[in-house]
């Protein structure tokens, strides 16, 4: 089943080189990996590894194609009907509560507990207590962050030239 | 209390290589990114390159590759770099720098000077 | 690379004033951007993360917005010791790169 995407789902994208036309819009929507013209007549193909669209839509511009950030792999690349998929770099995954961060995985449990659960590009290794079986959740205590330059010597004045 | 307490200053001649040491208190590097950024007299920062000490992965800024290299003790909880074929210009502070995301620094040291002279 | 530009080089403002520094990135790097303060001597020292989360421990006074291109960090009202140099720095992509740095200064 289709869902519909229109035009005030996205931000428009300027179009950088012509594209090649297609068939006539059906019903006023034109397919997957298209977008309609401005007079509505024809349906543009997106710009492959540029832009895409999922599904029938009424779309002035196709969808901006996601870059991977520093802190992901790419696992496929955007095509015209897909956007990229991105995850978490080995060693890292993406909290819920911030979706747009890759977190490194801690590498140990807490004292009294054991490691019950591998990282994964979605979750933190998985510890329980030794006893009880419980949970834990939350971070290692020197793992958090508060920030603060170390203390030591002053390294050199560091000024701005020009 | 999470501190990076890098090695002493250091005077070397063209040429020479130098290798500088951070060792951090406080948290288990492998559970962290550890960076490093140089500083050049009355200059700005230039990041120079990222490992992760859980497995070893680095990434270096082109224009430091085969300049710098970066590795880690995991047993002594100590981070290093080493410069080769110093230059004047390679003269700068550099820090050692946390992070518990690969995409900002929380925690830097109070850096090491490397001046580069004859 | 993505080059980070930072205006003005040098800003002159009052204590107690408000003080204003631009970032701008040579792409959109979405909100993948963090603002740091160097005093004299010092290590520098995170302030604001992700264009505009604030840090444990920075007071609240420090405020950064914007998103893509365009990056603000705002400084409420002036105290003595925020006269320093800011750099920002985006995460985005690889390498990592830093602005050239503003010096607030005592006007």
């Known amino acids: 089943e289709s869902a519909l995407i229109t035009q005030q789902d996205l931000a428009p994208q300027q179009r950088a080189a012509p594209q090649q036309k297609r068939s006539s819009p059906s019903e006023g929507l034109c397919p997957p990996g298209h977008h309609i013209s401005e007079d509505g007549r024809d349906c543009i193909s997106c710009k492959y590894g540029q832009d895409y669209s999922t599904h029938w839509n009424d779309l002035l511009f196709c969808l901006r194609c996601t870059r991977c950030d520093s802190g992901e792999v790419e696992l496929s690349p955007c095509t015209t009907t897909r956007n990229t998929v991105c995850q978490c770099e080995e060693g890292t995954f993406r909290e819920e509560d911030s979706p747009e961060m890759c977190r490194k995985c801690r590498t140990g449990c807490p004292r009294g507990m054991v490691k019950v659960g591998d990282c994964t590009p979605w979750s933190d290794i998985e510890c329980v207590h030794k006893e009880s079986g419980t949970k834990h959740s939350g971070e290692v205590p020197a793992v958090e962050e508060t920030v603060t330059s170390s203390p030591g010597t002053p390294a050199s004045p560091c000024s701005l030239s020009g | 209390e999470v501190q990076l307490q890098q090695s002493g200053a250091e005077v070397v001649k063209p040429g020479a290589s130098v290798k500088l040491s951070c060792k951090a208190s406080?948290?288990?590097?492998?559970?962290?990114?550890i960076h490093w950024v140089k500083q050049a007299p009355g200059q700005g920062l230039e990041w120079i390159g990222r490992i992760d000490p859980a497995n070893g992965n680095t990434k270096y800024d082109p224009k430091f590759q085969g300049k710098a290299t970066i590795t880690t003790d995991t047993s002594s909880n100590t981070a290093y770099m080493e410069l080769s074929s110093l230059r004047s210009e390679d003269t700068a502070v550099y820090y050692c720098v946390r992070g518990l995301y690969t995409y900002y620094f929380d925690y830097w040291g109070q850096g090491t000077l490397v001046t580069v002279s004859s | 690379e993505i080059v980070m530009t930072q205006s003005p080089a040098t800003l002159s403002v009052s204590p107690g004033e408000r003080a204003t520094l631009s970032c701008r990135a040579s792409?959109?790097?979405?909100?993948?951007l963090h603002w740091y303060q160097q005093k004299p001597g010092q290590a520098p020292r995170l302030l604001i993360k992700f264009a505009s989360q604030s840090i444990t421990g920075i007071p609240a006074r420090f405020s950064g917005s914007g998103s893509g291109t365009e990056f603000t960090l705002t400084i409420s009202s002036l105290q003595s010791e925020d006269f320093a140099v800011y750099y920002c720095?985006?995460?985005?992509?690889?390498?990592?790169?830093f602005g050239q740095g503003t010096k607030l200064e005592i006007k």
């Open positions: 792409q959109s790097i979405s909100n993948n």
């Open positions: 720095q985006q995460g985005n992509s690889w390498p990592y790169t």
């Open positions: 406080g948290f288990n590097i492998k559970d962290t990114f």
